[in-house]
Amino acid sequence: MSGLGRSRRGGRSRVDQEERFPQGLWTGVAMRSCPEEQYWDPLLGTCMSCKTICNHQSQRTCAAFCRSLSCRKEQGKFYDHLLRDCISCASICGQHPKQCAYFCENKLRSPVNLPPELRRQRSGEVENNSDNSGRYQGLEHRGSEASPALPGLKLSADQVALVYS
């Protein structure tokens, strides 16, 4: 099925006690009022973990979450929730956020691998890539297409719900 960014009408929010959602899938709250990283599936009549649909084309209801999950799998990148984009740490070392600290500090210890602008920074020729607000520029842009199917997804322990084998 192809991606349909659906927000279906209707649905019922009642669930009986004998129906089991052990990992808190069913929130017991009003329809479409789901916790973060979950979405309301009106045909199932429950909240579902966004992880269930990151492998599917039909993921626009969870697009940002799926992009961030995809991004976190890539070494040297982090997902910026404000920009809603996957950012390459290499492009912002020097004025990097804490998510890039490990990557950038390792890079700085190994100047052979540094891009020219970072080698210049190390020799005192600092280029200011940040704007007035202090946010970084020169980002590696990945648009909404940056949420491909994620076969064989491996998640870290702090990411609740599904772990795909």
Epitope: R8, E19, W26, L43
Partner: antibody, heavy 118, light 107 residues
């Protein structure tokens, strides 16, 4: 290729129980919701309930609560439906069907025929 | 629950005919209407989802239309292998519900 292979036909006595199976292959079993559907001879399709194999969460049609119990076995990628206290009204073909997260059921098992007769 | 009604329970047509099967929902389901084909041996296949989107492997002679409460499935050039019962299903609201089916036969 996605396939749902259901267990063979059952002939059982009234008052007894039966457990039918639906073995999934060609995809990651825990990534999809499995639904069960009933079809009485010459009639339409009636939704029974579903199971989320990754955490065994279930939801049932009111009509089948206490009658059907849905379970799954992740190690064998198999979903099960147990029907209890059988009556002639339970004689039907039962299908398992995979939910595609788009509101439709994209793959179906071949059906298990259940006949309840003394 | 949303009621799905297929007013025509059986339909006779000749090979090569253009055949239209209709389905009505008891309330607005937007475009979340799916069609299934059940062969005489009981095999069920998804034909179309979201009113008009063909499932993989389904011939292009099948098409769907409609919105809201009234929907139709059209077979443009009826072939022998299309002899089956066709069911609609709403995918808009829990619980999923199906139409009663339309059995397609050869004249």
């Amino acid at each position: 290729e996605v396939q749902l292979q259901q267990s063979g036909p059952e002939l059982v006595k009234p008052g007894s129980s039966v457990k039918m199976s639906c073995k999934a292959s060609g995809y990651t079993f825990t990534n999809y919701v499995m639904h069960w559907v009933k079809q009485k001879p010459g009639q339409g399709l009636e939704w029974i309930g579903y199971i989320l194999p990754y955490n065994d969460g279930t939801k049932y049609n009111e009509k089948f609560k206490g009658k059907a119990t849905l379970t799954s076995d992740k190690s064998s990628s198999t979903a099960y439906m147990e029907f209890s206290v059988l009556t002639s009204e339970d004689s039907a073909v039962y299908y398992c069907a995979r939910y595609d997260y788009e509101g439709s059921f994209d793959y179906w098992g071949q059906g298990t025929a259940l006949t309840v007769s003394s | 629950d949303i009621q799905m009604t297929q007013t025509t329970s059986s339909l006779s047509a000749s090979l090569g005919d253009r055949v239209t099967i209709s389905c009505r929902a008891s309330q607005d389901i937007s475009n979340y209407l799916n069609w299934y084909q059940q062969k005489p041996d009981g095999t069920v296949k998804l034909l179309m989802c979201y009113t008009s989107r063909l499932h993989s492997g389904v011939p292009s002679r099948f098409s769907g239309s409609g919105s809201g409460t009234d929907f139709s499935l059209t077979i443009s050039n009826l072939e022998q292998e299309d002899i089956a019962t066709y069911f609609c299903q709403q995918g808009n609201t829990f619980p999923p519900t199906f139409g009663g089916g339309t059995k397609l036969e050869i004249k």
